[in-house]
């Protein structure tokens, strides 16, 4: 006899990285017929939804109008059908960005390299932080973590055309509070024609569309849970 229902899916719209004072909606998708959903923050009850009519609703939304460091952290949700509760969802790490300062991102030997060259990114922030994050813009939000007193280095090793794209970095004050994003650095990797044509390049964005990137990146993936890429989320843990 089944003692618990399958776990629901949890995600953030438009993105799990939320600039401070901006709004975000945490979505929880369970089953039709669920009479109650509970959202938990850092292990404690945060909000409750009792959808009506339950038989016509399988997803609820918890709105956060004003993102700040107190709202940043780990969320999970559960739902109930009759008296039977579900397993808890995976953890959603909600991150507040645009805190305090802006780091500087540089790349060595330079932004234009040949396939096979060793490339290292450097992220520098003079204020009190020791953790840095390097993100490649695109649908899968590749995230790398680095450490250093005022600067972290991110060696990519010998690059291929798959490394092409636009990069930004953040200083991290804790796992869920990040700095403003750095200015973008576009890495151009040249190789032979065959490699270039086969390279799985992520979509990139002009320098002034970082806000749009935050609003659009992974939204489609978050709604299609079979494709959801947990790379960034897992790196936060």
């Amino acid at each position: 006899q089944q003692q618990t229902l399958p776990k629901p899916f949890i995600w953030a719209e438009p993105h799990f990285m939320v600039p401070k004072e901006k709004q975000v909606t945490i979505c929880c998708q369970g089953n039709y017929g669920a009479v109650e959903y509970q959202l938990h923050f850092e292990g404690s009850l945060f909000a409750v939804d009792r959808p009506k009519p339950p038989e016509r609703i399988n997803k609820v939304q918890f709105y956060i109008p004003d993102m700040n460091s107190r709202m940043a952290g780990q969320y999970s949700c559960i739902y109930r059908v009759g008296e039977l509760w579900s397993e808890p969802s995976n953890l959603l790490d909600l991150v507040v960005t645009e805190m305090y300062d802006t780091p500087t991102l540089s790349v060595h030997p330079g932004p234009e390299v040949i396939s096979g060259e060793k490339v290292t990114f450097y992220c520098r922030l003079d204020t009190a932080t020791s953790m840095f994050l390097l993100l490649k813009e695109g649908r899968s939000s590749h995230v790398q973590r680095g450490y250093g007193k005022v600067q972290a280095e991110f060696p990519l090793g010998p690059v291929t055309t798959a490394h092409r794209g636009t990069y930004r970095c953040f200083g991290s004050y804790n796992n869920h509070a990040w700095s403003f994003p750095s200015e973008p650095v576009k890495l151009l990797v040249t190789g032979d024609i065959e490699n270039t044509s086969l390279a799985p390049e992520d979509p990139t964005f002009p320098a002034d569309t970082w806000g749009t990137y935050l609003l659009t990146t992974e939204t489609g993936l978050q709604k299609d849970h079979a494709l959801w890429d947990h790379t960034a989320q897992n790196l936060l843990r």
Epitope: F46, A47, V48, R50, Q61, Y63, I64, P65, D66, M71
Partner: nanobody, 130 residues
Framework: EVQLVESGGGLVQPGGSLRLSCAVS????????MGWFRQAPGKDREFVAA????????YYADSVKGRFTISRDNSKNTAYLQMNSLRAEDTAVYYC???????????????????????WGQGTLVTVSS
């Protein structure tokens, strides 16, 4: 400027009843989830009850379930907490609170965490004693 003003507190004997009111001005009250919290002397603030903006969902702390009833009148911009079968351990300052932001809240959602609330009243003291 947002203002939340509680009233209705006072001294009551164990087993008695009180009705607290919370009048809200400066916000579009009718689309905002509301909550009641309390803080007893020397203790942390704790959740008491919450209500969705449509009144379709209410939620209570286990300690008050079956004794307290939260309600609201959107036409009067007022939320209420009806407290029956009061006990000595209900003695506390009671605060009403409203969530922040715009009008995008689901009609059936309530918030139980104090951190979810942006605006707070000054509190009204409820003393249960014989």
């Amino acid at each position: 400027e947002v203002q939340l003003v509680e009233s209705g507190g006072g001294l009551v004997q164990p087993g008695g009843s009180l009705r607290l009111s919370c009048a809200v001005s400066g916000r579009t009250f009718s689309r905002l989830p509301m909550g009641w919290f309390r803080q007893a002397p020397g203790k942390d603030r704790e959740f008491v009850a919450a209500i969705s903006w449509s009144s379709s969902t209410t939620y209570y702390a286990d300690s008050v379930k079956g004794r307290f009833t939260i309600s609201r009148d959107n036409s009067k911009n007022t939320a209420y907490l009806q407290m029956n079968s009061l006990r000595a351990e209900d003695t506390a300052v009671y605060y009403c609170a409203a969530v922040g932001g715009s009008l995008d809240y689901s009609a059936t959602v309530v918030y139980t965490a104090a951190r979810a609330y942006a605006d707070w009243g000054q509190g009204t003291l409820v003393t249960v004693s014989s």
